[in-house]
Interface confidence: medium
């Protein structure tokens, strides 16, 4: 069996004038193509992988949102040589998730990598941005995580921070076929540089306190001890799932119309960005691996 | 029936500038990647510089790079490219390519640029 | 130079088969990057011959057929006729250049 090859982390990998093509190990009957797209509120990215696969032919689609990152997952096996170039891959420079102009900042910063390589978001080197409240969600959070795709024994993975709706979340994750999104999250201005080493204690949790010991005195102590009991109840899980999106258009010869950098689109919007202009639309380079594609 | 029309060529003198459009019909452009490939009289094929549908992406042969910038406007269906300093070794027929799948599939005509004094 | 070699010059008679070849390197046709092949008829654009190293564009007859072994590539084009006469370009992604780099063309002449 012969596939076609790549790996794609948020740059143009996978691009059409980049394509390879490899011959697949005896007993090896599969080709296989994924590609998992992260969005923030400030723009999107994907990683993508092509190559000889394992087990059986089929799709599989899903979306997933961690505290208000949304994550979209493309699984396509095939057991025809090269026929791994359906999906469309995003391999371009994302351009940011919406208008953010439109909406006010709410007060909170947050370091932002979205397709930065683990290089460039490094402690406090990352971009800054300014979170804002969208579709009735309020993103006061900042994140500091990663995604990772599995496929074609190739493993990819990238940084991932930003603005979330939750400022408390410690190594919380979404998975999908082959995809993992996890993090923590944390309250207050740029406070993302750096939470691998969170634990699970949050402002959510009362304090223990220790008190002083007893005076040897009699006279009734004023000192008192107040904990805070008003946090919201965090609920067990806010992995949501995401409408499926729709079909992609199969890989066809070249006569055809180049589409190679569409965006898939989501069938619907994630809850709490349907009213941002590119919800659910991830650039797709999908073509022979083009500047893009390696291919000319 | 997919188009490429190539426009802005002439003649310019050493250190000049240029610049090249290419009108696209026929296809969605904005779903396209697009490429600029030159050949100079008498010589083969040199790829010059590509972008990315959304144009957010752009990428250039050495020869050219921080003197030639890519661009484009979907709304309008044209492609860019924009020739500063040019030599005398720019001289050459320069190609607007659609990328389709894998490959060049399509071609426009090709306007001459001569950089002579 | 060009990054991927070619023969300056092939000919033929009409009727026969002709074979043009494309020589590489580890950074591009032998890492794997497919290869394509342009056409080029006198006085006009290229036009895409054969991509994704042996795959025909609607409308390519299938007289030209593709290769590639290694980091070689070759074009083959049977039944040769008077209107194949033309500069064939071969084509791959260059790792180091990062780039689509082509052959230097093979002028073919129909004899």
């Known amino acids: 069996l012969e596939c076609y090859s790549c790996v794609q982390k948020a740059d143009d990998g996978c691009s059409p004038n980049k394509m390879k093509t490899v011959k697949c190990a005896p007993g090896v009957d599969v080709c296989t193509e994924a590609v998992g797209a992260v969005e923030t509120i400030h723009g999107q990215f994907s990683l993508a992988v092509r190559g000889c696969g394992s087990g059986l032919p089929g799709k599989n689609d899903r979306g997933l949102d961690l505290h208000g990152l949304l994550a979209f997952i493309q699984l396509q096996q095939c057991a025809q040589d090269r026929c791994n170039a359906k999906l469309n891959l995003t391999s371009r420079a994302l351009d940011p998730a919406g208008n953010e102009s439109a909406y006010p900042p709410n007060g909170v910063e947050c370091y932002s990598c979205v397709g930065l390589s683990r290089e460039a978001c490094q402690g406090t080197s990352p971009p800054v941005v300014s979170c804002y409240n969208a579709s009735d969600h309020v993103y006061k959070g900042c994140f500091d995580g990663n995604v990772t795709l599995t496929a074609a024994n190739v493993t990819v993975s990238l940084p991932v921070r930003g603005c979330v709706q939750d400022e408390f979340c410690t190594r919380d994750g979404v998975t999908g076929p082959g995809f993992t999104l996890s993090g923590s999250c944390c309250q207050g201005s740029r406070c993302n540089s750096d939470l691998r080493n969170k634990t699970y204690f949050s402002p959510r949790i009362p304090p223990l306190v220790r008190l002083p010991p007893p005076e040897p005195t009699t006279v009734a102590s004023t000192t008192s001890v107040t904990t805070s009991t008003s946090a919201p109840v965090r609920p067990t899980s806010t992995t949501k799932p995401m409408p499926a999106p729709t079909s992609q258009t199969p890989r066809q010869g070249v006569e055809h119309e180049a589409s190679r950098d569409e965006e898939p689109r989501l069938t619907g919007g994630a809850a709490g960005h349907q009213d941002r202009s590119n919800s659910g639309q991830y650039p797709a380079k999908g073509g022979p691996q083009q500047p893009h594609n390696k291919g000319c | 029936e997919v188009q490429l029309l190539e426009s802005g060529g002439g003649l310019v003198q050493p250190g000049g500038s240029l610049r090249l459009s290419c009108a696209a019909s026929g296809f969605t452009f904005s779903s396209a990647w697009m490429s600029w490939v030159r050949q100079a009289p008498g010589k083969g094929l040199e790829w010059v510089s590509y972008?990315?549908?959304?144009?957010?992406?752009?990428y250039y042969a050495d020869s050219v790079k921080g003197r030639f910038t890519i661009s484009r406007d979907n709304s309008k269906n044209t492609l860019y490219l924009q020739m500063n300093s040019l030599r005398a070794e720019d001289t050459a027929v320069y190609y607007c390519a659609r990328e389709g799948l894998w490959a060049f599939d399509y071609w426009g005509q090709g306007t001459l640029v001569t950089v002579s004094s | 130079e060009s990054v991927l070699t070619q023969p300056p010059s092939a000919s033929g008679t009409p009727g026969q088969r002709v074979t043009i070849s494309c020589s590489g390197s580890s950074s591009n046709i032998g890492a794997g990057y497919v290869v394509h092949w342009y056409q080029q008829l006198p006085g006009t654009a290229p036009k895409l011959l054969i991509y994704d190293n042996n795959q025909r564009p609607s409308g390519v007859p299938d007289r030209f057929s593709g290769s590639k072994s290694g980091t070689s590539a070759s074009l083959a084009i049977s039944g040769l006729r008077s209107e194949d006469e033309a500069d064939y370009y071969c084509a791959a992604w260059d790792d180091r250049l990062n780039g689509p780099v082509f052959g230097g063309g093979t002028k073919l002449t129909v004899l």
């Open positions: 972008i990315s549908s959304s144009g957010s992406s752009t």
